[in-house]
Interface confidence: medium
Amino acid sequence: SPVPPSTALKELIEELVNITQNQKAPLCNGSMVWSINLTAGVYCAALESLINVSGCSAIEKTQRMLNGFCPHKVSAGQFSSLRVRDTKIEVAQFVKDLLVHLKKLFREGQFN
């Protein structure tokens, strides 16, 4: 049976918590990703940014979970209108920013 949206968001948040707390070496070897506008369409925008990171097992589960939230198919190299123009940040910082934003969405009761 489908997982309730609130449960799915909790699980995504917990996965991001695990990533930030279990980080020993630089996450994804210090890979850089496009920074995104967190105010709208956050799940698809985050996936469009993170999908360009390959060979990083630490975020593979996050990528799969974000895919479940995004209603359309996302592929590597896809341009997002929600990305912050010409700004790249480390995956570790991206995950931290995304985590705080998703917790705020959860606190607001916005599960979709």
Partner: antibody
Framework: QMQLVESGGGVVQPGRSLRLSCAAS????????MHWVRQAPGKGLEWVAV????????HYADSVKGRFTITRDNSKNTLNLQMNSLRAEDTAVYYC???????????????WGQGTMVTVSS | SYVLTQPPSVSVAPGQTARITCGGN??????VHWYQQKPGQAPLLVIY???DRPDRIPERFSGSNSGNTATLTISRVEAGDEADYYC???????????FGGGTKLTVL
């Protein structure tokens, strides 16, 4: 400097009413959610009520719902708490508190007043 | 409504590390804030959004949050850290702010 100053506390009989006020200064009052938090003697903190920046939304603790009303006047930088049908268990120090807003949720309480004491006793 | 559980008291020797816990169902999904309150004073925000520290709060204060427990950690504890500490979250289900019961930190 940024400041919140409460007034209106005192001794009141059970069943009666009291109105608390809070004067804000040193910051853009109209851009913040405002809360009341209380603390009974020797007890922990208890959240009482919130009103959003534009006054459009209010929420209350179950213990005061239907008896207390939170209002604000952004033109005068004041926050109020109208307390009706007071009970002995409402005896506490009442703090006026500022919190940044994120849509319709409260962020951390980053500025507190010094509190005003309300005693409900016959 | 959402319930936050704190130990009533924690004792620690000066210079040691104090850990104050705040338990709640899947609290890791919530943003947790921590306040310090000394006798006769209003509370003071010491940690917000799980891990962030306001200006003027020493680096000795840190926070973490995952699973069912949030933790306030105070390293190299000083006598001046003796106070009551409260955790707090916003509960979207009831649209209410919730405080833990508070923990009295005693510096031996």
């Amino acid at each position: 400097q940024m400041q919140l100053v409460e007034s209106g506390g005192g001794v009141v009989q059970p069943g009666r009413s009291l109105r608390l006020s809070c004067a804000a200064s040193g910051f853009a009052f109209r851009t913040y959610g405002m809360h009341w938090v209380r603390q009974a003697p020797g007890k922990g903190l208890e959240w009482v009520a919130v009103i959003w920046d534009d006054g459009s939304n209010t929420h209350y603790a179950d213990s005061v719902k239907g008896r207390f009303t939170i209002t604000r006047d952004n033109s005068k930088n004041t926050l109020n708490l109208q307390m009706n049908s007071l009970r002995a268990e409402d005896t506490a120090v009442y703090y006026c508190v500022r919190a940044p807003q994120w849509y319709l949720t409260a962020e951390a309480f980053d500025l507190w007043g010094q509190g005003t004491m309300v005693t409900v006793s016959s | 409504s959402y319930v936050l559980t704190q130990p009533p008291s924690v004792s620690v020797a000066p210079g040691q590390t104090a850990r104050i816990t705040c338990g709640g169902n899947m609290i890791g999904a919530y943003l947790v804030h921590w306040y310090q309150q000394k006798p006769g004073q209003a509370p003071l925000l010491v940690i917000y959004d799980d891990v962030d520290r306001p200006d003027r709060i020493p680096e000795r204060f840190s926070g973490s949050n995952s699973g069912n427990t949030a933790t306030l950690t105070i390293s190299r504890v000083e006598a001046g850290d003796e106070a009551d500490y409260y955790c707090q979250v916003w509960d979207h289900n009831t649209q209410q702010m919730v405080f833990g019961g508070g923990t009295k930190l005693t510096v031996l």
